[in-house]
Interface confidence: low
């Protein structure tokens, strides 16, 4: 048999808090336990779920957990079933709500001397105790014409008068806790003698010298007083007007009329109503003078045919807000169609060439009108006036390639040479009409040129081939003065190019023929063995049929090339001693000798007292210092050639002789001792 060891019991529970209904069973075989609520099976949720055989509540809910719970144990094999005793919760709760008007039915029906009942919609179990407040101050039962009914949660004001006006709220507390009204009720009972607004003045915007009217009315019993004040608190009446409000009139109904309004009249006007009792009511209205600023300039616009474009008109600052419209050719644009206005925008859909022209944005308000033009150009694809032609250009002269096009707006022309953009420099120049000028045509300018003419609407391009007509010229021109080494073989080259391959020959300048040991082989003058007589002036002549002939004059010198008789040696000198670097060269013409020390040429005229270069070319340095150390180069040169040789100079401290060394021991390196 199934036996309940622990049965659920009825208990107090708090709304939103934890609870547990216990159930424990003992049976000979396996049983499964489930729970019923008012006879229906309980489904597990995150809030309410089976915990072993017991039923656990994470947060008790007064609506979902009200009813009778029962624990059921069932043996699925035998079908035996046992049910526990019933258990239920006594759930304690409190819930806030608003303060509402119970009587009369609507706020509009509240009159002085009528009964007013308010209800506090705070509920709970056990029933809470209520406390009422007006403007935050507690109200006690039976005081000052009001009664509190705790059972009905009502506050009754009988009769209600102006002194009962205020913000009503309520709070309630019970064993569970406390809550206050979620929404409070404002009771407003007018005192007939208080001034009330019937008509409030509105802000007005007027143009200069126009008139402005402010309306203002109050009501009360007995009738209230009404007074107008301007900004500086000056009263405005028909009898006493401030100097700057001479044209002000106050009408019997309270309206204030200002005529011929000027800037000094702009400002805040106050209408003050005062009843027999109660505070004055102050209503304010501002008089603004209409104004309109200038409009910003438009940049000219370029559009392409077939596209859709918009131009936004920023309205000028103004009061009142200026209205904006667009015009074209003096006609206001519609708000639909192909060319139309949308908001502040000019819209051109599927643009045609005929849409080009001046469009005007107008802005206007009471203060006046402003306008601003925008010039719209409809771009067209360029068309050819003159395409570039295949051309023959002469080397060394300026060359021109045309690229003449027309379009709206004026097209932009760029040139390409071998597909590379030509940037203007000293050799290339693109004229405004698109023509390309090559300032001094060179042989390698013979290639393909392409020009492209563009507008926002599109581009066209064409190409042409340039052939360069070569000059007859030496390539390279022979050096005008050349040397040949005596008693050696020598060659003097001469080559030239032209539109046709030129013939090249050498001759002596005096017209005499070349000796037999000198040959002219396809422009190269060849000396088998140079003699002194080979020196002199020679002319190289290049010629072809169409271009005639050109000449290059060369003066040949015969020389004995330089050799060194004495070369400087690696030298080490004690500090303070004198260093001698010897150098002697021979050749014809006789060579001159220069020295270079520490990477600079030693100028004989600026050497100072410590250094000297002898006639034979040797260099002497007195009183040497460590900074004199370094490489020294002897340079020998004449009009025909130049040779150099170098050696290092080391400056060292003089060693103090040690006793172990005899007075005659040599130093470990070559020394100059002076």
């Amino acid at each position: 048999a199934i036996v309940f060891i622990k049965q659920p019991s009825s208990q107090d529970a708090l709304q939103g808090r934890r609870a547990l209904l216990r159930c424990e069973v003992e049976a000979p075989g396996p049983v499964h336990v489930y729970w019923l609520l008012d006879g229906a099976p309980v489904q597990d949720t995150e809030r309410r779920f089976a915990q072993g055989s017991s039923l656990s509540f994470a947060a008790v809910d007064r609506l979902q957990d009200s009813g009778t719970f029962q624990c059921v144990a069932r043996d699925d094999v035998t079908g035996e079933e046992a049910r526990s005793a019933n258990a239920s919760f006594n759930i304690k709760w409190i819930e806030a709500g608003p303060v509402v008007l119970k009587h009369p039915a609507s706020e509009a029906e509240i009159q002085p001397q009528t009964q007013v009942t308010l209800r506090c919609h705070i509920d709970g179990h056990p029933r809470p105790t209520y406390q009422w407040f007006r403007d935050g101050t507690p109200l006690s039962d039976g005081q000052s014409n009001h009664t509190v009914s705790s059972k009905e949660r009502n506050l009754t004001l009988r009769p209600a008068g102006p002194e009962h006006s205020g913000l009503y709220s309520c709070c309630a507390h019970s064993a569970f806790g406390q809550a206050c009204s979620s929404q409070n009720f404002t009771l407003s009972i007018a005192d007939e003698s208080f001034a009330r607004v019937v008509l409030a003045p509105q802000d007005v915007v007027v143009a200069r010298y126009e008139e402005a009217m402010f309306h203002c009315q109050f009501s009360a019993q007995p009738p209230p007083s009404l007074q107008w004040l301007f900004e500086d608190e000056t009263p405005i009446t028909n009898r006493s007007r401030p100097p700057h409000l001479r044209r002000a009139t106050v009408f019997a109904n309270g309206s204030l009329l200002l005529t011929q309004v000027r800037p000094r009249n702009a400002g805040i006007y106050r209408c003050i109503g005062q009843g027999q009792r109660g505070p004055p009511i102050i209503l304010e209205a501002t008089l603004h003078l209409a104004e309109i600023e200038d409009m910003p300039l438009f940049e000219p616009r370029v559009f392409t045919a077939g596209s859709e474009e918009r131009v936004t008109c920023l309205p000028p600052k103004g009061l009142p807000e200026p209205s904006v419209w667009w015009e074209h050719a003096g006609v206001r644009l519609p708000t639909h169609g192909r060319v139309y206005q949308k908001g502040h925008e000019l819209v051109l859909a599927n643009i045609a060439e005929s849409d080009a022209g001046v469009y005007t944005c107008h802005a206007a308000n009471l203060a006046g009108q402003r306008r601003q033009d925008v010039n719209i150009t409809v771009a067209t694809v360029p068309s050819w006036l003159k395409k570039p032609q295949d051309s023959q250009l002469e080397e060394g002269k300026p060359g021109y390639l045309d690229c003449l096009t027309q379009a709206t707006p004026k097209p932009t022309v760029v040139w390409y040479r071998n597909q590379m953009l030509i940037s203007e420099d000293s050799r290339f120049e693109v004229f405004k009409n698109g023509t390309l000028r090559i300032n001094s045509v060179e042989v390698y300018d013979g290639t393909w040129y392409r020009c492209m003419s563009s507008t926002p609407a599109g581009s066209i391009e064409a190409q042409a081939r340039v052939q360069v007509l070569e000059k007859l010229k030496f390539t390279p021109p022979p050096q005008p003065q050349q040397c040949m080494e005596f008693d050696k073989e020598a060659t003097v080259p001469c080559s030239a190019t032209g539109r046709e391959k030129p013939t090249i020959k050498w001759e002596r300048a005096d017209g005499s023929s070349l000796p037999e040991w000198v040959t002219d082989n396809a422009g190269t003058l060849h000396f088998a063995r140079v003699t002194r007589d080979d020196a002199g002036n020679y002319t190289c002549i290049a010629s072809n049929g169409p271009q005639g002939q050109i000449r290059a004059h060369v003066q040949l010198t015969v020389a004995v090339f330089i050799t060194f008789k004495v070369e400087p040696e690696r030298t080490t000198v004690y500090q303070g001693h004198t260093a001698l670097l010897q150098c002697e060269a021979q050749g014809d013409p006789k060579p001159l000798i220069q020295w270079k020390g520490k990477d600079r040429i030693l100028d004989p005229t600026k050497l100072g007292p410590r250094m000297h270069i002898f006639q034979n070319g040797s260099l002497v340095i007195h009183d040497v210092a460590p900074e004199d150390s370094g490489r020294y180069t002897c340079i020998a040169g004449n009009s025909c050639n130049i040779k150099h040789t170098e050696a290092p100079l080391y400056v060292v401290d003089k060693p103090v002789p040690e006793e172990s060394e005899g007075p005659g021991s040599p130093p470990p390196y070559k020394m100059i001792q002076t």
């Epitope: 708000t335 639909h336 192909r338 949308k342 908001g343 925008e345 859909a349």
Partner: antibody
């Protein structure tokens, strides 16, 4: 709180007329384009028409000639006049407010009013 | 007549999924970016999510984002939440030149997988 409230919906016979109102609180409706959108039961949203701040109106092709939008600035209200109504005009009609006078995209919607066209 | 094509028409997904809805217009939009996305739940008015193609409306969670320009746009929900199951609409603004000022997509119904 800014809100739009539609009214005037109800049951009407085919061929009949109806005028819907859209009243704003918390904003001056004259500063915005106002759009009417409808939604047939179980279907998607469908643009009906628009009235701009400068009182220009545009309509969906199917609405041209039968529907008219107007505004009364003093009442802060926009109207949709619907004539020659058909069964297929049965829908919830929403009025909506644009972002500004030059952007038609809808920023604020009303709660909608049901129009039923049936005999 | 301008047509806004939304895809897919229906979409089943799970909480945490990344969801992408596309909207294609038959012509370029006003300013190339005048497009808004709205969420609608049964019996309610639509709610603005995204405007000007990519700007997040006030109070809308950052998991919603929009992108695109010209005629093709997308709405992305980076990590789907239980509250996101609803119908989504795109709204495109056009020039009014042909009379079409606004056009809605046919809607995408997002349901629980």
């Amino acid at each position: 709180e800014v809100q739009l409230v539609e009214s005037g919906g109800g049951l009407v016979q085919p061929g009949g007329s109806l005028r819907l109102s859209c009243t704003a609180s918390g904003i001056d409706l004259s500063n915005y384009a106002v759009i009417w959108v409808r939604q047939a039961p179980g279907k998607g949203l469908e643009w009906v028409g628009i009235i701009y701040t400068y009182d220009t109106t545009y309509y969906a092709n199917w609405a041209k000639g039968r529907f008219t939008i107007s505004r009364d600035t003093s009442k802060n209200t926009v109207y949709l006049q619907m004539n020659s109504l058909r069964a297929e005009d049965t829908a919830v009609y929403f009025c909506a407010r644009s972002f500004s006078d030059i952007s038609d995209l809808i920023k604020l919607w009303g709660q909608g009013t049901l129009v039923t066209v049936s005999s | 007549e301008i047509v806004m094509t939304q895809s897919p028409s229906t979409l089943s997904a799970s909480v945490g999924d990344r969801v992408i809805i596309t909207c294609q217009a038959s012509q370029s939009l006003y300013n190339n970016k005048a497009l808004a996305w709205y969420q609608q739940k049964p019996g309610k008015a639509p709610k603005l999510l995204i405007y000007e193609a990519s700007k997040l409306a006030s109070g809308v969670p950052s998991r919603f984002s929009g992108s695109g320009s010209g005629a093709e746009f997308t709405l992305t929900i980076s990590s789907l939440q239980p509250d996101d199951f609803a119908t989504y609409y795109c709204l495109g603004e056009f020039s009014c030149g042909s009379g079409d000022c606004l056009a809605f997509g046919q809607g995408t119904k997002l349901t629980v997988l």
